[in-house]
């Protein structure tokens, strides 16, 4: 028999001429129909057809239904499940292939099974809960597992109902948190970590950058707690800009001026000196307030000298050599 409508709850569909080889150029269609609230399990026990031959299973009562599977060539034992109460089986053999090249054919057992287009119900997990995206666990449904505070998901937290009505992942579990969360970075600091995942006993040490002072605890330790999950011994500290004492203002040199004219100069500030006309600066024209404990000036303050003073002193040195003698002894000495 090459085609037919079957309404039995169980039976067998055989290739034409089974157990002899099937003929070439065949186009057979079988329709299998079971009770409306049931579905069909297809147990393909033998499938030995040529590479140019096609066996197609449609998930419904005609050739426009979704293709459950399409096969050519030999294949070992396998099963298919329909999503409804009807299946259409189509077999097409290649008209051009030599009869000697043909295989034995196929043997398909079918059984009416309880309708089940949903994945199996997922259990609750200790110390956690699940939230389905829809009440019916049909294909495509996603179930998310979450853990109560103090517990963390081990395994995949998201499970999906697949086409074959199995779940995409194994059931996860909720395990007690045995580590502290990352306490985070602190601005203007670097940190030294004893263990990367912050288990109980781990320490994090914060070291402030130069010019910043630490406020709080520099070392945090992860401790277990009696009721809650593990916690750091303290909050992360802060690194605040160091408040350095200013330098006290220097007085302007005689016959000169300074800028700016303030009494206190913050660490890092620079003051500039200048002299009145006819005077020259001896020393540094600019000096800086060097940050420190205490802050201090980089150089001593300069002085302003009369511009002609150098020439005056040079000429006076000759005058001294020609000074009038005070006595003959001095004369002899000269």
């Amino acid at each position: 028999v090459c085609s037919g409508e079957i309404t039995d709850s169980a039976g067998v569909v055989l290739s034409p001429n089974w157990p002899e080889p099937y003929g070439r150029g065949q186009d057979c269609i079988w329709g299998v129909h079971v009770e409306e609230d049931k579905r069909i399990m297809l147990d393909i026990r033998v499938l030995r057809i040529g590479p140019g031959d096609v066996l197609t299973f449609y998930d419904g009562d005609d050739l426009t239904a979704r293709v459950l599977g399409q096969y050519s060539g030999p294949r070992s034992h396998f099963k298919l499940f329909t999503s409804m109460a009807d299946v259409t089986i189509q077999f097409q053999s290649d008209p051009g292939t030599s009869v000697l090249g043909y295989q034995q054919g196929f043997v398909i057992h079918f059984f009416e099974v309880p309708r089940n287009d949903t994945c199996p119900e997922l259990p609750e997990i200790p110390n956690g809960w699940k939230s389905p995206s829809q009440p019916e666990l049909v294909h495509g449904t996603v179930v998310t597992y979450q853990c109560y505070p103090g517990y963390q998901v081990v395994g995949s937290s998201v499970l999906m109902c697949q086409w074959d009505l199995t779940w995409s992942e194994d059931l996860p579990s909720c395990q007690r948190v045995t580590s502290c969360h990352d306490p985070g970075d602190v601005e203007h600091s670097r940190r030294l970590i004893s263990s990367p995942k912050f288990p109980v006993g781990a320490t994090v040490q914060y070291i402030c950058d130069q010019g910043f002072v630490l406020m709080g605890s520099s070392i945090l330790t992860c401790h277990d707690r009696q009721a809650g999950s593990p916690k750091w011994s303290d909050r992360a500290p802060k690194c605040l800009l160091e408040q350095l004492k200013p330098c006290h203002g220097l007085s302007a040199p005689e016959n000169g001026a300074r800028s700016p004219e303030k009494q206190l100069h913050p660490a890092g500030a620079t003051i500039h000196f200048s002299c009145a006309p006819g005077y020259v600066l001896k020393g540094q024209a600019s000096i800086k307030c060097v940050p420190g404990h205490p802050s201090h000036w980089s150089d001593p303050p300069p002085i302003c000298r009369a511009a002609s003073l150098d020439g005056f002193y040079n000429s006076r040195s000759l005058d001294v050599a020609k000074a009038p003698a005070a006595s003959s002894t001095l004369d002899a000495a000269h």
């Epitope: 109560y148 505070p149 103090g150 288990p199 109980v200 707690r225 009721a227 809650g228 999950s229």
Partner: antibody, heavy 116, light 112 residues
């Protein structure tokens, strides 16, 4: 500043139950566990149990298991202790106290007298 | 349960004197992972709630005068008041948090 304000004194009959409250202020309630300690002349300071307000996990002294239930209300930053089947031996000052590994803030204390 | 034993049960000293009290636990309170001793000292003045003085066996709580010093490790601990003041009149309790919480019976400090 950080404070734990406890409910007023209670005079209860033997066999009755009492619920004490402890309102926290001046800090983030869920950041610390809240524990309950009682004090009597005979037994001194006795730890009763504690609750983690973030997770609602509780831990109890074996002596008080089944007799005490600890709860909390995050919206009002208040911890509660229900004490059941009271006897004269449960007459004590009951303290709520904040802490994870040591108790750095203590409540004002609630005096519970069990008498017929 | 961890049992905490304190001695002496009471002590009378004069203002300015040094006082030492001890606390022994029935098992070690040193956590090998955190390297801390889970022991605290509390002060309770007459008619008041207890107050934290020392934690991790030797760390002074903020605002506690430096005349109070905690020392010791494992199962033997000491609280020392270097120069007793009149306001130190109180009962001093040690408490462990290594496994749940238990307290010692207290040392009553009286001023002569």
């Amino acid at each position: 500043q950080v404070q734990l304000q406890q409910s007023g004194a209670e005079l209860v009959r033997p066999g009755a139950s009492v619920t004490l409250s402890c309102k926290a202020s001046g800090y983030t309630f869920t950041d610390y566990e809240m524990h309950w300690v009682r004090q009597t002349p005979v037994h001194g300071l006795e730890w009763i149990g504690g609750i983690d307000p973030e997770s609602d996990n509780t831990v109890y002294n074996q002596k008080f298991k089944g007799k005490v239930t600890l709860t909390e209300d995050k919206s009002s930053s208040t911890a509660y202790m229900e004490f059941r089947s009271l006897t004269s031996e449960d007459s004590a000052v009951y303290y709520c106290t904040r802490g994870d590994w040591y108790f750095d803030v203590w409540g004002t204390g609630t005096t519970v007298t069990v008498s017929s | 349960d961890i049992v905490m034993s304190q001695s002496p049960s009471s002590q009378a000293v004069s203002v300015g004197e040094k006082v030492t009290m001890t606390c022994k636990s029935s098992q070690s309170l040193l956590n090998s992972r955190t390297r801390e001793n889970y022991l605290a000292w509390y002060q309770q003045k007459p008619g008041q709630s207890p107050k934290l003085l020392i934690y991790w066996a030797s760390t002074r709580e903020s605002g506690v005068p430096d005349r109070f010093t905690g020392s010791g490790s494992g199962a033997d601990f000491t609280l020392t008041i270097s120069s007793v003041q009149a306001e130190d009149l109180a009962v001093y309790y040690c408490g462990q948090s290594y496994n749940l919480f238990t307290f010692g019976s207290g040392t009553k400090l009286e001023i002569k």
